[in-house]
């Protein structure tokens, strides 16, 4: 069986401030079992945007419906998109674990540039 | 409900350090990101700093840059704000805020912790 | 850096008077703007995010308005325990996070 892929087909994202932007993941397997989560940036610093498990995150809805039985599309829109939200978006696959799940594989990233807001 | 319970204020001599202690509980602490911001005698609000949901990312405002140190340890819900060569400027009431999600407002405060740098 | 302004810095009405406080920014912070609420010895207390939106268990009275550089808080018919500090918070460029200078919201 081939070892799951985290896909991110687009490189980069370009939305004006105020509006949403939509960034696209998909997974090849259901296998292993785990949450997936957003980052922005990469390495320590990397800014939690999304966490399928836990959390309220309020700007950041899902495309389609994660819970569904099956489901391999995990694809998030941000709203309300700011100057300080630019940068690059990763989907994350993590695999369950005790106490705490572990990171399995990351997307290739996806850059989001804002521009100004048309006046 | 979200509560956020500074401790470690009190009274200290200029240069000497102090350590305090924002222990939160009722939300999922880990996904949020967390700051220290805070209140001197008769003045308005000055963000201190900032440390993202991981615990990697951090930042600060000058006036405190290079001596203070902002931390997090999410396996005990705790943010800690490590402060060194106090001055008599430094003397405020200190509040951990917590973000509503990482670009964004601080939507719940705690009540606050006094120090006072005084020779 | 964005500076928030705030005015005026003391309001002083009567009990089921209009109060507005006005928060201007010196660049575009869209609508990424907060008010808080202070009372005499107590913690800050978020009442209004997003320019306009109320936030969990505020009162109706309480309402903003704005977008840009130029916003409102308005208390509609201001109550005795209304009487605080009353600061706005920009969070559309950081860091650092902005905070204006407070008005004061006496209740005669």
């Known amino acids: 069986e081939d070892e799951l892929q985290v896909i991110q087909p687009e490189k980069s994202v370009s939305v004006a401030a105020g509006e949403s932007a939509t960034l696209r993941c998909a997974m090849t397997s259901l296998i292993p079992v785990g949450p997936i989560m957003w980052f922005r940036g990469a390495g320590a610093g990397r800014e939690l945007i999304y966490n399928q498990k836990e959390g309220h995150f309020p700007r950041v809805t899902t495309v389609s419906e994660l819970t569904k039985r099956n489901n391999l599309d995990f694809s998030i829109s941000i709203s309300n998109i700011t100057p300080a939200d630019a940068g690059t978006y990763y989907c994350v696959k993590f695999r369950k674990g005790s106490p705490d799940d572990v990171e399995f594989k990351s997307g290739a990233g996806t850059e989001l540039s804002v521009r100004a807001k048309p006046s | 409900d979200v509560q956020l319970v500074e401790s470690g204020g009190g009274v200290v001599r200029p240069g000497e350090s102090l350590r305090l202690s924002c222990a939160a509980s009722?939300?999922?602490?880990?996904?949020?990101?967390m700051n220290w911001v805070r209140q001197a005698p008769g003045e308005g609000l000055e963000w201190v700093s900032r440390?993202?949901?991981?615990?990697?990312?951090?930042d600060y405002a000058d006036s405190v840059k290079g001596r203070f140190t902002i931390s997090r340890d999410n396996s005990k819900n705790t943010l800690y704000l490590q402060m060194n060569s106090l001055r008599a400027e430094d003397t405020a009431v200190y509040y951990c805020?917590?973000?509503?999600?990482?670009?964004?407002?601080?939507?719940?405060w705690g009540l606050g912790a006094l120090v006072t740098v005084s020779s | 850096e964005t500076v928030l302004t705030q005015s005026p810095a003391t309001l002083s009405v009567s009990p089921g008077e209009r109060a507005t406080l006005s928060c201007r920014a010196s660049?575009?912070?869209?609508?990424?703007l907060a008010w808080h609420q202070q009372k005499p010895g107590q913690a800050p207390r978020l009442l209004i995010y997003d320019a306009s939106n109320r936030a969990t268990g505020i009162p109706d009275r309480f309402s903003g308005s704005g977008s840009g550089t130029d916003f409102t808080l308005t208390i509609s018919s201001p109550q005795t325990e209304d009487s605080a500090v009353y600061y706005c918070q920009q969070y559309y460029y950081w860091p650092p996070y902005r905070f204006g200078g407070g008005t004061k919201v006496e209740i005669k």
């Open positions: 009722g939300f999922s602490f880990r996904s949020y990101a």
């Open positions: 805020a917590k973000q509503y999600d990482w670009n964004s407002f601080f939507d719940y």
């Open positions: 660049q575009t912070v869209g609508s990424k």
């Open positions: 440390i993202n949901s991981g615990g990697g990312g951090t």
